[in-house]
Amino acid sequence: TQNKALPENVKYGIVLDAGSSHTSLYIYKWPAEKENDTGVVHQVEECRVKGPGISKFVQKVNEIGIYLTDCMERAREVIPRSQHQETPVYLGATAGMRLLRMESEELADRVLDVVERSLSNYPFDFQGARIITGQEEGAYGWITINYLLGKFSQKTRWFSIVPYETNNQETFGALDLGGASTQVTFVPQNQTIESPDNALQFRLYGKDYNVYTHSFLCYGKDQALWQKLAKDIQVASNEILRDPCFHPGYKKVVNVSDLYKTPCTKRFEMTLPFQQFEIQGIGNYQQCHQSILELFNTSYCPYSQCAFNGIFLPPLQGDFGAFSAFYFVMKFLNLTSEKVSQEKVTEMMKKFCAQPWEEIKTSYAGVKEKYLSEYCFSGTYILSLLLQGYHFTADSWEHIHFIGKIQGSDAGWTLGYMLNLTNMIPAEQPLSTPLSHSTYV
């Protein structure tokens, strides 16, 4: 007799990452009977919502529904109709909304209100929209990459099934760079975590993890640029800002009101004798690097050692996955290869920043000028943050792996968030008894 294919017993989950610069929707899929196994959940779709981050809709909240439509309709198409009602939808908002909340809780609530109303209209099981903490963002990013790298699996393998796998169970650290914040998360080596705010304890698959994490609000690449501009315009003699972080020949007019709109520039705010100023690029990596370093206060540390701004940071340990904007920026600059040393990266950045703007525009004709103009700053910022901020060295640079995807799933906090909320990471190692063995095959 012919074997009939059984309908696949799968489940789906949807997570929306409402970041400061944009929103992305991720669809995950897993075999229903293997929920407690490690590494079985994978991403089947990413849909980038057209437009800015949700915090930018504060004066036009009525447009949020339309903004989310395309990607939510895409989810309707990808997920079988029979599964819609049992598919959870989570929205997590990150540093863009944390900043808006700092400015006005009422405005942040208005945005979340319209987001909830919009997402509740779809046939899925809406599970709330919330502003996640920086600590969660770091922790879930760490869980995501280690889950995808198979670090929580108890089965030791003599062969590698995923890139970067070193066949040991040492977890990877996680380095996440967004537009408004950046997170560093790792398991320190036998080191006491001196500040309780930075300490997390997990029990995952029968093993205990003492994890260090910190989220630096205002130190995402976009907010760091606003900070740098606000700092530098203080000492400008007129409404011209000669900026080493932009290519020679680049020009852009900035409104002072836009500069001081974000809480991240409050510390540099002053009354200026002009409403606008013009950035004029001079394209000098070294000067750009020096200007960026002034954003990191390293003169004060109440602990045995700090990153910057008085924040405790234990000695770096092991390998790190650097993802989100760490990856996107370095990928654009063609600097993600494991073979490229830190010295080579610095050399390449010096050359790139010194290239005239007209030349850059010709070489990268397909790239939006808004993004293209900021790669010199962003690349320099990444180097400054990793080397001076987090104390990576030329030697330890080789332990940083710039990762976009692992096994087809994006590196980032969303998968870890969903795994946690769907209770798919057991504290104890699931038992494989002879009776239930087929479940684990």
């Epitope: 909340r101 809780e105 609530d109 979340l112 209100d113 919330r130 502003i131 996640i132 903490t133």
Partner: nanobody, 115 residues
Framework: QLQLVESGGGLVQPGGSLRLSCAAS????????MSWYRQAPGKAREWVGS????????TYQNSVKGRFTISRDNAKNTLYLQMNNLKPEDTGVYYC????????RGQGTQVTVSS
């Protein structure tokens, strides 16, 4: 300072009802949307539902739709959760939060559904 105090929990049989309350102080209650969350032992904290600042709109997760009702009295700075036809899987600690907050601030109130 900002305070949210939940009350009204208890032991109830399957099919029974409970009404939880949340007394709010230290902020302008009528300006913010509110949410209820719950956490069962060994499980992640789970969103139950939300209500808008004015109380004109509510939304719920699927498993409680038609059984739970969130309401608010802005004059009394109080949020409510009416729970009917309770099931054993509704057991957990229930927390109220301001929708803009990342985590509950109160101690929560224990709801146990058991025969």
């Amino acid at each position: 300072q900002l305070q949210l105090v939940e009350s009204g929990g208890g032991l109830v049989q399957p099919g029974g009802s409970l009404r939880l309350s949340c007394a709010a102080s230290g902020f302008t209650f009528s300006n913010l949307g509110m949410s209820w969350y719950r956490q069962a032992p060994g499980k992640a904290r789970e969103w139950v539902g939300s209500i808008s600042a004015s109380g004109d709109y509510t939304t719920y997760q699927n498993s409680v739709k038609g059984r739970f009702t969130i309401s608010r009295d802005n004059a009394k700075n109080t949020l409510y959760l009416q729970m009917n036809n309770l099931k054993p899987e509704d057991t957990g600690v229930y927390y109220c939060t301001r929708r803009v907050d990342s985590y509950p601030r109160g101690q929560g109130t224990q709801v146990t559904v058991s025969s």
